[in-house]
């Protein structure tokens, strides 16, 4: 079959301080030397762009500076971080992988990973 | 809203060149994939080539490879394509389509003709 | 190279009646990859379908995808005039991106 299968895990809960983890992990059909990982979040339909990374095999992933997303590369296996949730950014996390180079170009899309937020409980007013 | 506006197309003879323009609007061009896609006269859709974010990796159809180059100016939002050697049977109307955040063509542009012919 | 055939090549139908349009890939395609356009003459190809079954934005519920492996299937459920039209499948999860030759439905 001449797709790329990605795997990521079906559901995560969020730290209390709005952060949550998941692994990205594709099977490559071919020998890539250049990677590029989207994370998109589905939310009625509509998919939006989380964040995005392009990586050389055997080197660090590198978000842009401003991005809510880190991660590590690991063969072919991407360890991604999304912080700054919020309960209201609960939903569909779905992990895009491309291919890039050498040619030929491989698109695989993961189900997606339900990540879960709670907002914490703001801390009582001490009485003294 | 969402658009993309080519332009460019024309009368050309063979063997000679023009290059094809496609103005994007309405979303962040830099973020996704540019393809172009043709159509000869009363026949099916051909995939061209594209072009990928930063403008890095590109791919190309054999029957233009070493004759037309894709190239983007993301300062500009806008999608080239160099037709270069042209031949009767690249007479088509050229589209510019954008590669979706899950892959299908989901935007298009309205299409401009370019005839090849002596 | 993925080759696609589309069957039939026509189809003509009446107004109202269900239209079954079939999409062969010569070899397994993932689900996840596989588009449909609609193409009206003069006009530039509009997606209908991606994913095999997910339904673009804006597209009517008479629309509908399916399959998986080397075969798919469009089906228009009720057609309505504006639906006479070329159908395209498309594979897009692999270089080079293929199309089918096209499916034409016409008015009977």
């Known amino acids: 079959c001449k797709a790329m299968h990605v795997a990521q895990p079906a559901v995560v809960l969020a730290s209390s301080r709005g952060i949550a983890s998941f692994v990205c992990e594709y099977a490559s059909p071919g020998k890539a030397t250049e990677v590029r990982v989207t994370v998109l979040r589905q939310a009625d339909s509509q998919v939006t762009e989380v964040c995005a990374a392009t990586y050389m095999m055997g080197n660090e992933l590198t978000f842009l500076d401003d991005s809510i997303c880190t991660g590590t590369s690991s063969g072919n296996q991407v360890n991604l971080t999304i912080q700054g949730l919020r309960a209201m950014d609960t939903g569909l996390y779905i992990c895009k992988v491309e291919l890039m180079y050498p040619p030929p170009y491989y698109l695989g899309i993961g189900n997606g990973t339900q990540i879960y937020v709670i907002d914490p409980e703001p801390c009582p007013d001490s009485d003294f | 809203q969402v658009q993309l506006v080519e332009s460019g197309g024309g009368v050309v003879q063979p063997g000679r060149s023009l290059r094809l323009s496609c103005a994007a609007s309405?979303?962040?061009?830099?973020?996704?994939?540019m393809h172009w896609v043709r159509q000869a006269p009363g026949t099916g859709l051909e995939w061209v080539a594209v072009i990928w974010y930063e403008g890095r990796n590109k791919y190309y159809a054999d029957p233009v490879k070493g004759r037309f180059t894709i190239s983007r100016d993301n300062s500009k939002n806008t999608l080239y394509l160099q037709m270069n050697s042209l031949r009767d049977d690249d007479t088509a109307v050229y589209y510019c389509?954008?590669?979706?955040?899950?892959?299908?063509?989901?935007?298009w542009g309205q299409g401009t003709m370019v005839t090849v012919s002596s | 190279e993925i080759v696609l055939t589309q069957s039939p090549g026509t189809l003509s139908l009446s107004p109202g009646e269900r239209a079954t349009l079939s999409c062969r890939a010569s070899q397994s395609v993932s689900s996840s990859y596989l588009a449909w356009y609609q193409q009206k003459p003069g006009q530039a190809p509009r997606l209908l379908i991606y994913?095999?079954?997910s339904r673009a934005t804006g597209i009517p519920d008479r629309f509908s995808g399916s399959g998986s492996g080397t075969d798919f299937t469009l089906t228009i459920s009720r057609l309505e005039p504006e639906d006479f039209a070329v159908y395209y499948c498309?594979?897009?999860?692999?270089?080079?991106?293929?199309f089918g030759q096209g499916t034409k439905v016409e008015i009977k």
């Open positions: 994913g095999a079954s």
């Open positions: 309405g979303f962040t061009f830099s973020s996704y994939g």
């Open positions: 498309q594979q897009y999860g692999s270089s080079p991106w293929t």
């Open positions: 389509a954008r590669a979706g955040d899950l892959g299908a063509f989901d935007i």
